[in-house]
């Protein structure tokens, strides 16, 4: 894990803009784990950050991520019909100035250093799921979610016409 103490030093001043230049409605510092209780961890390797999905050893500290919640400012057409009310979007930052990004070309989830305003690739539609879980859908690619593949985070297409088991796109958020 890296630089996580830096997350604790975040202030609202660092998070005072979104796509439309407004503040997030709230923020939440949490550890991220899979439906099967594997931890999402972050490591610096060869001058770039890697994201892992792994079982932590007992008493090993979990990495924390700062979730910044935003209202979508207009009725969205994320669902393809343009009739939705407001939704919740989220950005995820495990350390100062770095955010999770959707790389739709490579179907990968990456950590990128960037300045405000954040690009659309850093925003995810937040889905409230049962079993105390959430899912993260790419703002830039409706129907594509952050998921787990081969002990890494990846982008996974969820097709409502297919009987997919979605445990691999379910995540738990925990303050501990």
């Amino acid at each position: 894990a890296f630089g996580i103490s830096g997350v604790q030093k975040y202030t609202r001043a660092l998070h005072d803009s979104s796509i439309t230049g407004i503040s997030p409605i709230t923020e939440y510092l949490a550890s991220l784990s899979t439906y099967n209780d594997q931890s999402i961890t972050f490591a610096l390797e060869d001058e770039s950050y890697e994201i892992y999905v792994e079982d932590l050893k007992k008493d090993e500290k979990k990495d924390k991520v700062l979730l910044s919640y935003y209202e979508s400012q207009h009725p969205s057409n994320e669902s393809g019909d343009g009739v939705d009310g407001k939704m919740l979007m989220v950005t995820l930052s495990p350390t100062k100035d770095f955010w999770l990004h959707a790389n739709n070309k490579e179907h990968s989830v990456e950590l990128h250093k960037c300045e405000k305003p954040l690009p659309d690739q850093a925003f995810f539609v937040l889905h409230n799921m049962h079993s105390n879980c959430v899912s993260f859908e790419c703002k830039t690619d409706p129907g594509v979610f952050i998921g787990v593949k081969d002990n890494h985070l990846a982008l996974i297409k969820v097709d409502s016409s297919e009987n997919l088991c979605t445990e691999n796109i379910l995540f738990k958020l925990s303050e501990t």
Epitope: I25, T26, E27, Y28, L29, A30, L67, Y69, S76, E78, S79, G80, D81, V83, D84, G85, K86, M87, L88, V125, L126, H127, N128, M129, H130, N132, V134, V158, D159, S160, S161, E162, N163, L164, C165, T166, L173
Partner: antibody, heavy 121, light 111 residues
Amino acid sequence: EVQLVESGGGLVQPGGSLRLSCAASGFTFSNYWMNWVRQAPGKGLEWMAEITLKFNNYSTHYAESVKGRFTISRDNSKNTVYLQMNSLRAEDTAVYYCARRNYGNWYINVWGQGTLVTVSS
Amino acid sequence: DIVMTQSPDSLAVSLGERATINCRASESVDKFGLSFLNWYQQKPGQPPKLLIFVASSQGSGVPDRFSGSGSGTDFTLTISSLQAEDVAVYYCQQSKDIPYTFGQGTKVEIK
């Protein structure tokens, strides 16, 4: 136009059964969790049942008061959600609203006009 | 089950004045750093309409005079300047846990 239209309400005797239907139009029905909410005459709102999506294995959830008596189901090919009500009691008398949760499942943002179910002998 | 209790049961407010409705949950409705608390307005003979979600975010097309606040167990809906068309019953609802539960409703009338 986004619309939910309920049907199937009416007068039924205690112990009887009724099947409510809700026809959805104007949106991609298969993308949304659907709910039933009821309101007894002159009373408040009571959430009844919910059904999720195919990729959630159509999981269903119920209020304790109707668990084992009511069954929610959906037919995406017909854009319709159903509520099968068995062993009806006088206290089930209410207007039954079909309702759609928003994309992301945070709140209900589309409601039908409701259908009245009266349980009486 | 989480029990939602609203106060007052009814409220008479002069046009242009502020109306405040309180909602208390029997346990915290917070999760993921958000409050799973919605407010709905219901006018006679109509289905409910969403006003506020996650405690303080306005629904689409909701006038700015409606605002929500609170977290944990205590929440407030405020109508900053009551209009004639705001006469209705207002319900809070928690969506943190199944069964989703509503408050008993608060009837708002013109004084």
